[in-house]
Interface confidence: medium
């Protein structure tokens, strides 16, 4: 099975990198520093 | 709001079938993985079942395996748990539990919400 | 599989005052860089259980400051700085780093 983030999921992330959890069957999110949320897309203001 | 509603408990002899259900909403169901978590009577929590989102995954602890099938219908939002050739030490209160991710940065998966269970009684 | 043992069994308190729960894993939690699959849920009398700290010291959402865990690889602890009386309930620590998941036995708070 293809990994879902090179393909429906390639622009999911905003600030950070996709992740496919192959036993989960899940897309999910490793996000950069100071961003947090499901897409990385919301900033912690105390960073 | 999340919600997880258990049915299908009930009193079965000893060798029977039972199938469970749970019925969820408040959250997109085909996107998490679910579990089931049992807890026999004045007992701790023990694992019962975990299966990926799309069902091409499933996972048992060696006590239920070959013995009960976890599945799913993401059109339903339904999680099941069909119980085959039950003995007396599966009397328990099954809990379906939504497996997480919670995301802190970085995705993390735990049992983060449960539904109020249903009692399944193995007797003679 | 991994062996969660919780300790104490009963942990009878003051109201106000401060808990521990101890929490020992047979094999280390730490999951590569996903960090460390442990969690405490907490099960009030006749309720269900609910999640409480998840990777080791997370507090979930809408869970009071006064709970607090800790530790690392196998040795985890879970603290309640104050004790009230909504805290009365069966603790428990899971691990979910390896299946099958397993939980410890747990520990009864009450009130002394």
């Known amino acids: 099975k293809k990994n879902p983030c090179n393909a429906e999921f390639q622009n999911f992330c905003i600030h950070g990198e996709c992740k496919y959890i192959e036993h989960l069957e899940a897309v999910t999110c490793k996000c950069q520093q100071e961003y947090f949320g499901e897409r990385c897309g919301e900033k912690d203001l105390l960073a | 709001e999340v919600q997880l509603v258990e049915s299908g408990g009930g009193l079965v002899k000893p060798g029977g079938s039972l199938r469970l259900s749970c019925a969820a909403s408040g959250f997109t169901f085909s996107s998490y993985p679910m579990s089931w978590v049992r807890q026999a009577p004045e007992k701790g929590l023990e694992w019962v079942s975990t299966?990926?989102?799309?069902?091409?995954?499933?996972y048992y602890p060696d006590s239920v395996k070959g013995r009960f099938t976890i599945s799913r219908d993401n059109a339903k939002n339904s999680l099941y748990l069909q119980m085959n050739s039950l003995r007396a030490e599966d009397t328990a209160v099954y809990y379906c539990?939504?497996?997480?991710?919670?995301?802190?940065?970085?995705?993390?998966?735990?049992?983060?919400?449960w539904g109020q269970g249903t009692t399944v009684t193995v007797s003679s | 599989d991994i062996v969660m043992t919780q300790s104490p069994l009963s942990l009878p308190v003051t109201l106000g005052d401060p808990a521990s729960i101890s929490c020992r894993s047979s094999?280390?939690?730490?999951?590569?860089?996903?960090?460390?699959?442990l969690n405490w849920f907490q099960q009030r009398p006749g309720q269900s259980p609910k999640l409480l700290i998840y990777?080791?010291?997370e507090r979930f959402d809408g869970v009071p400051d006064r709970f607090s865990g800790s530790g690392s690889g196998t040795d985890f602890t879970l603290k309640i700085s104050r004790v009230e009386a909504e805290d009365v309930g069966v603790y428990y620590c899971s691990q979910s780093t390896h299946v099958p998941y397993t939980f410890g036995g747990g520990t009864k708070v009450e009130i002394k």
């Open positions: 539990a939504r497996q997480g991710p919670i995301y802190y940065g970085n995705y993390y998966y735990a049992m983060d919400y």
């Open positions: 094999q280390s939690l730490v999951d590569g860089e996903d960090g460390t699959y």
């Open positions: 299966i990926s989102t799309g069902g091409r995954y499933t």
């Open positions: 990777k080791v010291s």
